[in-house]
Structure formats: C-alpha cells, structure tokens
Interface confidence: low
C-alpha cells in the first residue's frame, strides 16, 4: 500500500556532546517491521543508520556514525521510529533524510539538524 513519510517540520536543535532524536513516521500508520527504514545524509547518501530484514545493518553505516546511532523501534508496529544520535558533533549539522521502503514502494522525508556550541550559551556571571 501507499503511504507518506512525515518528519519534523522545523529544524531540530542539539548541543555538541549531547544526544539528539530525529523522529520519523509513515502516514497512514501501519506496521513497518518488515520494511527497510533508514537515514542518510544528502547529498549522495552517507548512511547514518539502516534497518533491513528486521535488524540494524551496521556494516552499511558511514564510519563517522558507527557506534553513535540507535533506532528506537518501540512503535514500529504503528510505523513510527526515532533515530537517536549520541555525542553530537558540529559535523552532524545539516540535512538528514529518513526513508521507508516497502518492496518497490519508497517514500522519504527531509529534516534539518542545527548544532550549537554549549559554551556559547553560558550566561555571564
């Protein structure tokens, strides 16, 4: 069946060193356990995280994200997933694309991450 992929409408903000969560879901909601789900960084797809055949495909991940990502799948039965990135770096700033692939049917959503320096926001005094 056909579906749309929904991501956050506004940029997500995170501080360097923190962790951040990038939500993504399909609409209408349906079980995505058997789908391929992933995030990549355009242009031209540095793979941030890939889930296929019911498991995370660590081998396909870009080296800069190995060991730093986790796909939260508690609600995958309703078509909702969240990518958690730990130890956020300045280089994580920019566009991310989440996609769901069901056999030959695919849809995606773009989202943006803004990374800020925690020390910049320390108030004087």
């Amino acid at each position: 069946g056909q579906f749309r992929v929904i991501g956050p409408r506004h940029p997500i903000r995170a501080l360097v060193g923190d962790e951040v969560e990038l939500p993504c879901r399909i609409s209408p909601g349906k079980n995505a356990t058997g789908m391929e789900v992933g995030w990549y960084r355009p242009p031209f797809s540095r793979v941030v995280h890939l889930y296929r055949n019911g498991k995370d495909q660590d081998g396909d991940q870009a080296p800069e994200y190995r060991g730093r990502t986790e796909l939260l799948k508690d609600a995958i039965g309703e078509g909702k997933v969240t990518l958690r990135i730990r130890n956020v770096r300045f280089s994580d700033e920019g566009g991310f694309t989440c996609f769901f692939r069901d056999h030959s049917y695919q849809e995606e959503a773009a989202m943006e991450l803004k990374v800020e320096d925690p020390f910049y926001w320390v108030s004087p005094g």
């Epitope: 990549y40 031209f44 793979v47």
Partner: antibody, heavy 121, light 107 residues
C-alpha cells in the same frame, strides 16, 4: 508516471560550453536525485555527477570535476548540466536519469530521452 | 572509484538460448548492483536492482544473482526483443560506475 524530457541536440565549437536541461514531471522533483550520464559514440555509459534538488549540492565524478556544473530549479522541476571547455572527445549523447531519494543505494529507474552534443570546429 | 568489469564483451546467441553475463566489482558492493538493457538510439532501461530484484514490468526470464564482488545476469530463454547491450552499475558508493557493457547479438 514520471517523465524526464531533455532539451534538443547541440552543435558546439571546441573551447565553448553547453548547457543541457532535463524537465521532470510526475512525483516529487525535490526528493529525486538527478544524475547525468553520457555515452560517446559506440562507447559505454559514464556517470558525470548528480544533484538532489531539495538540498541543491551537487556531486561530481573526479574526471569531470571543475568542468561540469549541475544545478536544479525546483520552481520549474528542471535540472541542468553545463559542461565547459568542450573538446571533440565530449561528443556524446547526454542522459539525465532519476534515482528515488539518492543515487547511492537506489538505481536509476527513469531516464531522459538523451541529448546529442556534437563538438566540432 | 570502484571498477566494474563485465564479461564477455560480445555474446552471440540464438533465440531460446540461456544467456549469462558476468559483472565483477573491484571491491565489495554488497548487493547494490543494477542491470540495464540498452537498444541502439534509446536510453537504458532498468531490469534488475539490488542484484536480484526484478524491476516492475520486466519479464521473468531475466534474473540476477550474486553479492559482494561477483554478479550475474541470466536470460533463461532468449527472445528476439532481448538482442541489445547490457550494462551493470554499482550504486554502493558516492561515485557511481558502470561496466563496459555486453552486446548480445544474433548468432
């Protein structure tokens, strides 16, 4: 139904530039990845580079770096490929091709009809 | 860049023959391999993606197999419409590459 329609044939002088367009219809243009692939007479397919319009940044094959510029106009759903400093070896058919979302991990499922570029003095 | 090597370059066959084309990658590309068919004066057409998945609308006589560095395209019973040039393409890396092509001609 996705369609990619390219601009017409061009004849160019050595040293000049050519700009080929590729207008997409059907689907969501911004989330495609549009690549350019060329084929010299009697030769195989050669990937030149591509762009994801929603992000605007292009990626180029090493061989064409500095000589090719790929752009996209989201308002008209059109991608462009400009090749400069033309030489006779650039005589070829130039194709635009679409991959859904990204050309990495997704193959080209739709192609333009091709644009013949002839470089001759 | 990853090099893709196809063999043979030319293949002579008759209608009804079983035809196999091989594609070898210079390094592992997992299953990120596509096969295209091209006829003279026409754009390539996607036949197989992800090494073994048949594109919608492509006849079932076409099949693909392999992973890592070795891949094959098989046409189980060659039809008159199948005389064409076939290309493999890897889409595992940022810089995409094609094989040099295999021309299937009438014996």
């Amino acid at each position: 139904q996705v369609q990619l329609v390219q601009s017409g044939a061009e004849v160019k002088k050595p040293g000049s530039s050519v700009k080929v367009s590729c207008k997409a219809s059907g689907g969501t243009f911004s989330s495609y990845a549009i690549s350019w692939v060329r084929q010299a007479p009697g030769q195989g397919l050669e990937w030149m580079g591509g762009i994801i319009p929603i992000f605007g940044t292009a990626n180029y094959a090493q061989k064409f770096q500095g000589r090719v510029t790929i752009t996209a106009d989201k308002s008209t759903s059109t991608a462009y490929m400009e090749l400069s400093s033309l030489r006779s070896e650039d005589t070829a058919v130039y194709y635009c091709a679409r991959a859904p979302y990204s050309p990495t991990y997704y193959p080209f499922d739709y192609w333009g009809q091709g644009t013949t570029v002839t470089v001759s003095s | 860049d990853i090099q893709m090597t196809q063999s043979p370059s030319t293949l002579s066959a008759s209608v009804g023959d079983r035809v196999t084309i091989t594609c070898r990658a210079s390094q592992s590309i997992s299953s990120w391999l596509a096969w295209y068919q091209q006829k003279p004066g026409k754009a390539p057409k996607l036949l197989i993606y992800d090494a073994s998945s048949l594109e919608s609308g492509v006849p079932s006589r076409f099949s693909g197999s392999g992973s890592g560095t070795e891949f094959t395209l098989t046409i189980s019973s060659l039809q008159p419409d199948d005389f064409a040039t076939y290309y493999c393409q890897q889409y595992s890396m940022d810089h995409l590459t094609f094989g040099q092509g295999t021309k299937v001609e009438i014996k």
